[in-house]
């Protein structure tokens, strides 16, 4: 969709991982004066929502309240602006935003090798495992907008596991992992218990600004 106006922006508050039965606000905004905003979802159940734009200080926006969260509401969202209503003249679409429902299945376990406290520069690997036959595991770090994902390995000792090599440790952080199944990519398990990774001998434990991730499955992504 080329659109007669440039694309609006789409944000999720408080974030794109939404627990079952909770609500997420998807905010569509632009510095173009759009009278209408349309929010379109692709996924298990497609839908389009419409709101009239609000205008403040040269910004047009619409806050779409999505919830109580359930599987049909998870998917890839894009928002469009329109200056007219009948017919709509749609802008280019916003960048896609994947909204994931969590809390559907049993939580996996998260552990660190060699342990959750490591020396600066030492390599650390986080392992996510479960007796449930998850196809994918997703690792998130508190304060970062994106997760990295790995395919689960074959069943070993009754569990399915994925290892996330974090590389040489420079900064600590609180990590969680989730499991999901191949045919339901937007439907994730309960979160693992949080795992605090501490880096000792580090002059600063402040976080780097999150970098734009590569989202290729199976590519190690450094969340440190």
């Amino acid at each position: 969709h080329e659109g007669v106006h440039r694309k609006p922006s789409l944000l999720a508050h408080p974030g794109r991982l939404v627990k079952s039965e909770e609500t997420v606000i998807l905010q569509c905004w632009s510095d173009v004066r759009f009278e209408h905003f349309l929010l379109h979802r692709e996924g298990k159940f497609k839908d389009t929502l419409h709101l009239i734009g609000e205008h403040h200080d040269g910004v047009s926006k619409a806050n779409f309240s999505i919830g109580p969260m359930m599987q049909d509401l998870a998917g890839t969202y894009r928002c469009y602006g329109s200056v007219t209503h009948s017919p709509y003249q749609l802008s280019a679409p916003s960048d896609p935003l994947d909204i994931v429902i969590t809390g559907l299945y049993e939580k996996p376990s998260l552990s660190a090798q060699p342990g959750p406290t490591v020396l600066a520069g030492e390599s650390v690997t986080l392992s996510c495992s479960s007796r449930s036959s998850y196809d994918m595991y997703h690792l998130s770090r508190e304060g970062e907008a994106h997760e990295c994902r790995f395919s689960a390995g074959p069943k070993v000792n009754g569990t399915f596991q994925a290892d996330f090599p974090l590389g040489p440790a420079t900064h600590g952080g609180t990590y969680r992992c989730f499991g999901s199944f191949r045919d339901s990519p937007y439907e994730w398990s309960n979160s693992s218990d949080p795992l605090l990774v501490s880096v000792t001998g580090n002059p600063s434990n402040s976080w780097p600004s999150p970098t734009e991730p590569s989202s290729k499955t199976g590519n190690p992504r450094h969340l440190h």
């Epitope: 497609k46 509401l73 709509y88």
Partner: antibody, heavy 124, light 108 residues
Amino acid sequence: QVQLVQSGAEVKKPGSSVKVSCKASGGTFSSYAISWVRQAPGQGLEWMGGIIPIFGTANYAQKFQGRVTITADESTSTAYMELSSLRSEDTAVYYCARGLDTPNVVVKGAFDIWGQGTTVTVSS
Amino acid sequence: EIVLTQSPGTLSLSPGERATLSCRASQSVSSSYLAWYQQKPGRAPRLLIYGASSRATGIPDRFSGSGSGTDFTLTISRLEPEDFAVYYCQQYGSSPWTFGQGTKLEIK
């Protein structure tokens, strides 16, 4: 005042197809959620699927997947439901219905406006 | 799919009485995604309640809905002659959207 007006009754042979239309007047058809619901004689209601015309995206109940096609023509504010490989069990009244759309409604699955219904009889 | 079971199948009451219709789901349905309809012979259904408890436009306040999880209720506080019809509950919280089999409300 929004109205949905459906096409007339149809008599079809088993194995054939039927296409029912639903013309909307009033309101903004583009962003409507138009669903199709059927009711066999003396039976309850059954949701078949629906469409939102502006993006042409349709959802179907698994039971009808592959046999039903729901489309919409924005230029004429008309939605269509085509059901193929008809059998006697498809004899029913077919309704189009608009999903309630207010700012606090996130799923347009409660149907506030209905067409008058189209009777489809499948008989050899 | 979510199966909705309505009870009773038939309810015989007199005008002026209170009617209580039940709808039970085979699995939990968020109360935001449950509706009630009234249908008279030869007519299309009419939306009464959405979101389990919100009255649709133009519906008299003698109709009220309540419930959560798997148990939902439609109450008609004082039956009017025009209320005798078939009532359906419907969930739209999980596709495919499904309806109950209906409760027939008849004059005693």
